[in-house]
């Protein structure tokens, strides 16, 4: 988040009264992790665990398809820029069991915890590239026929991460590590010291960029594919919004505490109750942000199953199944599973 | 009452050393840290560092890192502060400090001070 | 390291004059406990520096109350409600949420 994430532990007689209790040693720690950054680290080692495993799968599955399949291309994307994102989740861990303590330095503190926010743009760039991909298909087939190519779709996704790369900048040239003197710890955050509109400004930019403008165009988006799909009595258009639906709403659920509580904060006093009750949150908000790393590969493989009715491939076959079939690209009723299903399959959650 | 005592005034050539003696009564030496503040002639106030007399830990200004080295000697409650390879941006008068409050120990700020101690270094 | 500004550097008073002293910390000093540690500090000619008021606000035991501190996030003031004798010497700002400790370089209060 952009405020100074820095919760300590319960240092509770230093926090109210700035005293100390003299029978105790000066420079007394707590070795109790709060409650929040507790349930932050559970999160966080899950996802660690099914985020690499699972986008490593998706990454190997799709990069043989991805010269001839367009679709490959897609999950291929979105899976490396999850499966970057979850390589800083080791560093995070530590400094949470460390009470916040961050002991790499500067440059990591300006890459590692900017990942997340890289992954959120990417994501939702590449989404929205899909999804334009998608509404393409459904309505402009002949369009497609001529220039539906993978040269186009590498091209898209470069765009993408050019401009996922630029918005994640603010971020990163904010963040610093700043030594508070007691207790003695290195904290790693973003400082925008006098420039409280600056910091309101990147809030309101990740806001709108990262969330809301993405939830309006991509439910259009989605709202005509999916009429346009039933009224041509589309097989599996059940399934199909199913998947979407729930696709579309991992990525909003998982990003909205981050999202609230990121421009509620730019708008607080640093010093204000409510900020203080909102920065002891912050780790549990990026850990609940970061389980869109790790959910992508699970929506496959449950949609898989759906399609298969049940498990009966290998993971990879599967996998391979769900996502590289290619679309096909025909404005008839066989506009089904390959064009709307396997698009379905990720097309919000980062 | 709480009082710090300095060791007196020092001349030095440059490339020396001068250790710094503060002695503190009037209260539990370890249950406060004790900090050094210099200032130079006319100039303003810049910190040093700290010593924890109660586990002998120490913080030093990143400056005076490598050059600065604090001691205690519990038995006498004195804190010592020696700077080593004195050069003529040395010369400032000396304090040492105690960080805590009225009745009770706080870390952030600097209630009661020595009366200074002038170190010159001059060739 | 936090550089902190005081302005003006010197200032010319008279006893019963109203002064305010301005300081400004080059980042944030705000801790992660959600306190400010920004003190003052005044000191007389070849004394020691005198503690007058710690965590932006609040007065030290023994400090008169026409001292007094207020201020957020950067920037910081001291006032001076009613100028005494005793009063005139130099003040500096101080914050110890950050290391290195660091000091403003002072303001010199002198007689008109």
């Known amino acids: 988040m952009d405020s100074f994430n820095y919760t300590t532990p319960d240092y509770g007689h230093y926090d109210d009264k700035d005293t100390l209790d003299l029978n105790t040693p000066v420079d007394k720690t707590s070795n109790t992790l709060r409650v929040p950054d507790i349930l932050a680290l559970v999160i966080f080692a899950v996802v660690f665990l099914v985020g690499v495993l699972g986008n490593a799968l998706v990454v190997w599955v799709t990069a043989f398809e991805a010269k001839r399949t367009i679709n490959a291309i897609w999950f291929l994307n979105l899976a490396v820029a999850d499966f970057l994102s979850c390589l800083a989740l080791p560093i995070l861990f530590t400094s949470i069991v460390q009470h916040h303590h961050w002991p790499f330095g500067g440059a990591a503190c300006s890459i590692l915890p900017s990942l997340i926010l890289l992954n959120m743009y990417a994501s939702i760039l590449l989404l929205a590239t899909i999804s334009a991909d998608r509404f393409l298909l459904v309505f402009k087939p002949i369009w497609c026929q001529n220039f539906r190519g993978a040269g186009l779709a590498w091209i898209a996704c470069a765009v993408a991460w050019g401009l996922a790369l630029l918005l994640t900048i603010p971020s990163f040239l904010y963040r610093v590590v700043r030594e508070e003197y007691f207790p003695p710890k290195v904290l790693c955050g973003v400082d925008y010291s006098h420039d409280k509109r600056r910091e309101r400004a990147v809030a309101i930019v990740r806001l709108v960029l990262g969330f809301l403008w993405p939830l309006l165009t991509l439910t259009i988006c989605y709202t005509f594919i999916l009429l346009r799909t039933w009224s041509r009595r589309a097989t599996r258009s059940t399934k199909t919004l199913k998947v979407v639906v729930a696709v579309v709403a991992s990525f909003f659920i998982f990003w909205l505490p981050y999202q609230v509580t990121g421009i509620m904060m730019s708008f607080l006093e640093p010093s204000s109750p409510t900020f203080l009750l909102l920065k002891k949150l912050d780790s549990l908000c990026v850990s609940f942000a970061y389980i869109n790393c790790c959910i992508n590969p699970i929506i496959y493989v449950v949609a898989g199953q759906g399609f298969q009715g049940r498990l009966r491939k290998s993971l990879p076959s599967l996998l391979r199944n769900v996502l590289t079939e290619e679309s096909v690209v025909r404005e008839s009723k066989s506009f089904t599973r390959s064009t709307v299903d396997t698009m379905a399959q990720k097309t919000q959650a980062v | 009452q709480v009082q710090l005592v300095q060791s007196g005034a020092e001349v030095k050539k440059p490339g020396a050393s001068v250790k710094v003696s503060c002695k503190a009564s009037g209260y539990t030496f370890t249950n406060y840290w004790m900090h050094w503040v210099r200032q130079a002639p006319g100039q303003g106030l810049e910190w040093m560092g700290y010593?924890?007399?109660?586990?002998?830990?120490?913080k030093y200004a990143q400056k005076f890192q490598g050059r600065v080295t604090m001691t205690r000697d519990t038995s006498t409650s004195t804190v010592y502060m020696e700077l080593s390879s004195l050069r003529s941006e040395d010369t400032a008068v000396y304090y040492c400090t105690r960080s805590g409050g009225d009745n009770y120990g706080n870390p952030y700020y600097f209630d009661r001070w020595g009366q200074g101690t002038t170190v010159t270094v001059s060739s | 390291d936090v550089q902190m500004t005081q302005s003006p550097s010197s200032l010319s008073a008279s006893v019963g004059d109203r002064v305010t002293i301005t300081c400004r910390a080059s980042q944030s000093i705000v801790h992660s406990n959600g306190n400010t540690y920004l003190h003052w500090y005044q000191q007389k000619p070849g004394k020691a520096p005198k503690f007058l008021i710690y965590k932006v606000s609040n007065r030290f035991s023994g400090v008169p109350s026409r001292f007094s501190g207020s201020g957020s996030g950067t920037d910081f003031t001291l006032t001076i409600s009613s100028l005494q004798p005793e009063d005139f010497a130099t003040y500096y700002c101080a914050q110890s949420t950050l290391v290195p400790l660091t000091f403003g370089q002072g303001t010199k209060l002198e007689i008109k």
């Open positions: 010593l924890n007399p109660s586990s002998g830990y120490t």
